[in-house]
Interface confidence: low
């Protein structure tokens, strides 16, 4: 029996856009003003969001779908949706508690967001350090000494430089 | 009172299936949109999939699309979430979570959803 009502319910013809009106008989109505549903059959539509402050337009509110917000310059995106948006740093620096720090000796960071981390250890690769490392770039490995024949020269171009914990694809 | 309880929760091997309910009471649970999140030791709260009141629309995280599937009987007050192909970094415990009827926020944020559910753990290991 249930089945049956379901099937037979008045706002299951409700397309997205509207919402289904109990108080004028079950009647298909516009969503409001500021309002979607992006999906048929919606008992209420549901309010945009609104970007405000941080927060700028990505995407126009329609009667179907929501706004989408992005971050204004110099912050960025955090969380599904960007329902968060956290300042940019500089290459080099990472955002704590106490703002933008420069990355310890050892660790760096190329990009305006996330933390900062170790310098990849070549040896571990059983290379050498082509190129050392700094704040904003991670160390560049190269060829092993024993790799090099008297006379070779070292303009072999170097390994990339893989992030830690990742392996080789 | 509202009141949301999941069960189904487990050990398993990778590649294998939960089904994981939820049943809800103190409220018509056929008016409101539904969810699963999960959260793993150590990380943030992640949604997994929404289902409309009516079941006419459903959204899933990309890493669980092809692989979960969440349902709902709304004469029992249940939600469902299936979970085959199972891997390890599908553990976490699992929040069914009910989305409010207004909302601001993007339909895969937190703040969507007033009423949640205590959880249910999902390990996932060999």
């Known amino acids: 029996f249930e089945r049956t009502r379901s099937l037979q319910d008045p706002c299951s013809n409700c397309p997205a856009g509207t919402f289904c009106d109990n108080n004028r008989n079950q009647i298909c109505s516009p969503c409001p003003p500021n309002s979607f549903s992006s999906a048929g059959g919606q008992r209420t539509c549901d309010i945009c969001r609104q970007c405000k402050g941080v927060f700028r337009t990505r995407k126009e509110c329609s009667s179907t779908s929501n706004a989408e917000c992005d971050c204004t310059p110099g912050f960025h995106c955090l969380g599904a949706g960007c329902s968060m948006c956290e300042q940019d740093c500089k290459q080099g620096q990472e955002l704590t508690k106490k703002g933008c720090k420069d990355c310890c000796f050892g660790t760096f960071n190329d990009q305006k967001r996330g933390i900062c981390r170790p310098w990849t250890n070549c040896s571990l690769d059983g290379k050498s350090v082509l190129v050392n490392g700094t704040k904003e770039r991670d160390v560049v490995c190269g060829p092993s000494p024993a790799d090099l024949s008297p006379g070779a020269s070292s303009v072999t171009p170097p390994a990339p430089a893989r992030e830690p914990g990742h392996s080789p694809q | 009172e509202v009141q949301l309880l999941e069960s189904g929760g487990g050990e398993v091997q990778p590649g294998g299936s939960l089904r994981l309910s939820c049943a809800a009471s103190?409220?018509?649970?056929?008016?409101?949109?539904m969810a699963w999140f999960r959260q793993a030791p150590g990380k943030e709260r992640e949604f997994v999939s929404r289902?409309?009141?009516?079941?006419?629309?459903?959204d899933y995280v990309e890493s669980v699309k092809g692989r979960f599937t969440i349902s709902r009987d709304n004469p029992k007050n249940t939600l469902y979430l299936q979970m085959s192909s199972l891997r390890a970094e599908d553990t976490a415990v699992y929040y069914c979570?009910?989305?409010?009827?207004?909302?601001?926020?993007?339909?895969?944020?937190?703040?969507?959803?007033?009423?949640w559910g205590q959880g249910t753990l999902v390990t996932v290991k060999p």
């Open positions: 979570a009910r989305q409010r009827s207004y909302s601001r926020y993007d339909i895969r944020t937190p703040q969507t959803y007033d009423y």
């Open positions: 103190g409220w018509a649970f056929g008016n409101y949109g």
């Open positions: 289902l409309a009141w009516n079941g006419g629309s459903t």
